[in-house]
Amino acid sequence: RSQQDPPCGGRLNSKDAGYITSPGYPQDYPSHQNCEWIVYAPEPNQKIVLNFNPHFEIEKHDCKYDFIEIRDGDSESADLLGKHCGNIAPPTIISSGSVLYIKFTSDYARQGAGFSLRYEIFKTGSEDCSKNFTSPNGTIESPGFPEKYPHNLDCTFTILAKPRMEIILQFLTFDLEHDPLQVGEGDCKYDWLDIWDGIPHVGPLIGKYCGTKTPSKLRSSTGILSLTFHTDMAVAKDGFSARYYLIHQEPPENFQCNVPLGMESGRIANEQISASSTFSDGRWTPQQSRLHGDDNGWTPNLDSNKEYLQVDLRFLTMLTAIATQGAISRETQKGYYVKSYKLEVSTNGEDWMVYRHGKNHKIFQANNDATEVVLNKLHMPLLTRFIRIRPQTWHLGIALRLELFGCRVTDAPCSNMLGMLSGLIADTQISASSTREYLWSPSAARLVSSRSGWFPRNPQAQPGEEWLQVDLGTPKTVKGVIIQGARGGDSITAVEARAFVRKFKVSYSLNGKDWEYIQDPRTQQTKLFEGNMHYDTPDIRRFDPVPAQYVRVYPERWSPAGIGMRLEVLGCDWTDSKPTVETLGPTVKSEETTTPYPMDEDATECGENCSFEDDKDLQLPSGFNCNFDFPEETCGWVYDHAKWLRSTWISSANPNDRTFPDDKNFLKLQSDGRREGQYGRLISPPVHLPRSPVCMEFQYQAMGGHGVALQVVREASQESKLLWVIREDQGSEWKHGRIILPSYDMEYQIVFEGVIGKGRSGEISIDDIRISTDVPLENCMEPISAFAVDIPETHGGEGYEDEIDDEYEGDWSNSSSSTSGAGDPSSGKEKSWLYTLDP
């Protein structure tokens, strides 16, 4: 350094704020500088904040020659917080401890104006701004309200409610600094308020808010709602004021999960409704998509099946039905409406699942005019937060008005979420048999709030070998679990695993040592629960209440990507539970009490909540439920007419098309037009149902014109009864069959008989045969056309096959699914049930 340059560097106490500049600032700094400053705070728990003057100019060249560097400590060996050059001033820098090291270096060549920074003690204001709220009502305000809020705040406000209490949060005023160029809601750069469903940064984020748009009323039934308030060191505004109150939730005894969720009423706020695009005149916005809204509806900018209307329900919600209308243009009085649509759901707004019926995307038949309401019920309720309606066909143009029906998980008796999602269950209470990552974060196993999930060390372990465990902290009454798949990069391959558990068992314990499995009340055997069909969409599985502090879930079968799981446990405090009858599915009522909404063909099933009148007598043979994906011993159905052929499982599916997550194989009877035709029988294990009728479900395809027939026969020792028959081409789509197996005092077998006539080309496929414990018997006739008014009984095993010429060589072979048929697996409008929408 030359003699005339003033010295630079030093040790500075930040008790009094001050400035550090490059020598000569704002004139060009000299060459050959090597300045070092140490800035320290007087108290060990204090931090230091540096704010740079925007007039910043240091020779660039990747900061090789001239630069300023800041380290999080008192020497050159401390962690680097930033190394800066060029002409863009660094952002605000805050130390983690009570000291910062700053170094400025210049070489012999080009110079610039240099830098100027202000240092001071970092005053958070946060030490005394965080609060917990437990009283029945209260006010939450930004610090100092109604005055402007302080800088550098990070405050947390947590509202805690007892079980069965709903938290309602209503903002009265709201004004936080925001970027005037901000594109979308939630793009908050400077000051913001985050609202969390649970503990901050653990539970799901409901929304991020800034600017002057007041957040709409929030209703949470998770038991904990948190707000985190962040402010920066610049502009301060008036802040916010909100009222909260707790309301006791007691659903009526006969509660049905078909409550309007709030499109028509406005309970779903405008900010929760969005779309892929909106018509450019601003008169057909997503916010105009409310059922019976009197001002147009939603219309996209261009009509295409890539457009969608989206609703964010904010919290995980059971969706059971969707009602749609078209809209009449105020400007022309012309009507526009959607004739069919697909449904997509997501728990996080990023991972979407197209709703299916069987193997195919379900295409819902919607409106036939612009004003009538058409209600489509889901054949299985969906647990979701985000919903997208994606129009497929329309009249004149897409126009949509909408209502959603359902309920919250917690509306059912003793169904509080016990804390995996919200974070009330701490990480230390979550454990597993093994984990893929060496340093595993137990938070990964949390329902929805985790972006990844739990993966065991061996993704293809033995059934029942791996488990995920939750310690509830104290004994609770446990009544169910919600399971969800998982996603995350594999440490071995760069591919993101999208895994889920297809079947599982649940065990429980009060002490962590003595374990019992949840039993199937019908068989008194360990219950094997149906799991997920997709890595994002969660499924609720309920069971009779058990006392437990520890709950374990054991995967038994899983997706090709292996075991992956996220979890929530449902229940209530040990003293809370009282036996009640639950029905979370919409009810069927007589016609005179129904609302006049035309119905889609699918009747709602009610998950684990339905039961038959006399379940204890149902003894299902092992191997009756069969999806033909596993080796023969797992499936009790036999082929009795010729040699069982297992063809190679060659998939014709596009590997990028995830049409079938796992269930890739099915039985196929095929004929290429040979002279003698085809005939094949598929026979169930023996069934004995002396008292209880049950519902048998299956998937089928039948292609080949008038030459194909598929029938289902009940064969007992002395007689045979035709139960179901289709006698013509059903198209290339997979369809859903349902048949009531009536009670019968003798043992019998179910036989599928497929026929392809002489010289005909065609194929008949069968898959996913199972007894459904979920479907009310009144909904167990599908398609209705397969049930003759009076099918005569036949004896001696002679039935419809008498109409078939001579002998056939049967060829049921195990085949892989093709993704070509993307139609609706249900045929036509087969049912005319009308459903009540009243709870």
Partner: antibody
């Protein structure tokens, strides 16, 4: 799918014109119908529309003396125009109004003369 | 009001030539515009809707374009049979309008 206007004819000034448009092959519950007229040697002039839900809009000049009604059961739309003058002499068309006027009737000539 | 101004009122074109007809709305009609062809003694025939979509059975020699307030119908490779009067029509708003049609353009083919 078609639309057809009833016969026009000769009318005297101050008379009331009643024309009926009969539709076939589609429903008036799903399509709107507009009335349009064309004076000899002139351009097309819109009179009004009845929407598929029954809402009606008239051109400003026609509002005071025109009435459009429909019968979905009979598949008919009726135009009534009062206080006819010689300026109302024109060919009257009814047209199905979908994404545009995609189906037109052949038209019917109405002459107003004393 | 949404007034439609069509230019020119008349145009001559030789067989094989190209003709361009313009339609201007007094305010944006957001591409809700149709074009019609009318021959003497016949009702109009729809050619183009939504500003640029060809109606079924219409020759691809007819092309519609434009957005906002400015729209164009272009007929290329003109044939004798194209001699007719052409009208534009706004389909955006019928409220408080005198007419939804433009004044018409007569195309004479030589």
């Amino acid at each position: 799918q078609s639309v057809k206007e009833s016969e026009g004819g000769l009318f005297k000034p101050t008379d009331t014109l009643t024309l009926t448009c009969t539709v076939s092959g589609f429903s008036l519950s799903t399509y709107s119908i507009s009335w349009v007229r064309q004076a000899p040697g002139n351009g097309l002039e819109w009179i009004g529309i009845i929407g598929d839900a029954g809402g009606i809009i008239y051109a400003t000049w026609a509002k005071s003396r025109s009435t459009i009604t429909r019968s979905t059961a009979l598949n008919t739309v009726t135009l009534k125009m009062t206080g006819l003058t010689a300026a109302d002499t024109a060919t009257y068309f009814c047209a199905r109004d979908g994404t545009a006027f995609d189906i037109w009737g052949p038209g019917t000539l109405v002459t107003v003369s004393s | 009001a949404y007034d439609m101004t069509q230019t020119p009122a008349s145009v001559e074109v030789v067989v094989g030539g190209t003709v361009t007809i313009k339609c201007q709305a007094s305010q944006s009609i957001y591409s809700k515009l149709g074009w019609y062809q009318q021959k003497p003694g016949q009702p109009p025939k729809l050619l183009i809707y939504r500003a640029s979509t060809l109606a079924s059975g219409v020759s691809s020699r007819f092309k519609g374009s434009g957005s906002g307030t400015e729209y164009t119908l272009t007929i290329s490779g003109v044939q004798c049979d194209d001699a007719a009067t052409y009208y534009c029509q706004q389909d955006y708003s019928y409220i408080n309008v005198d007419n939804i049609f433009g004044g018409g353009t007569e195309v004479v083919v030589k």
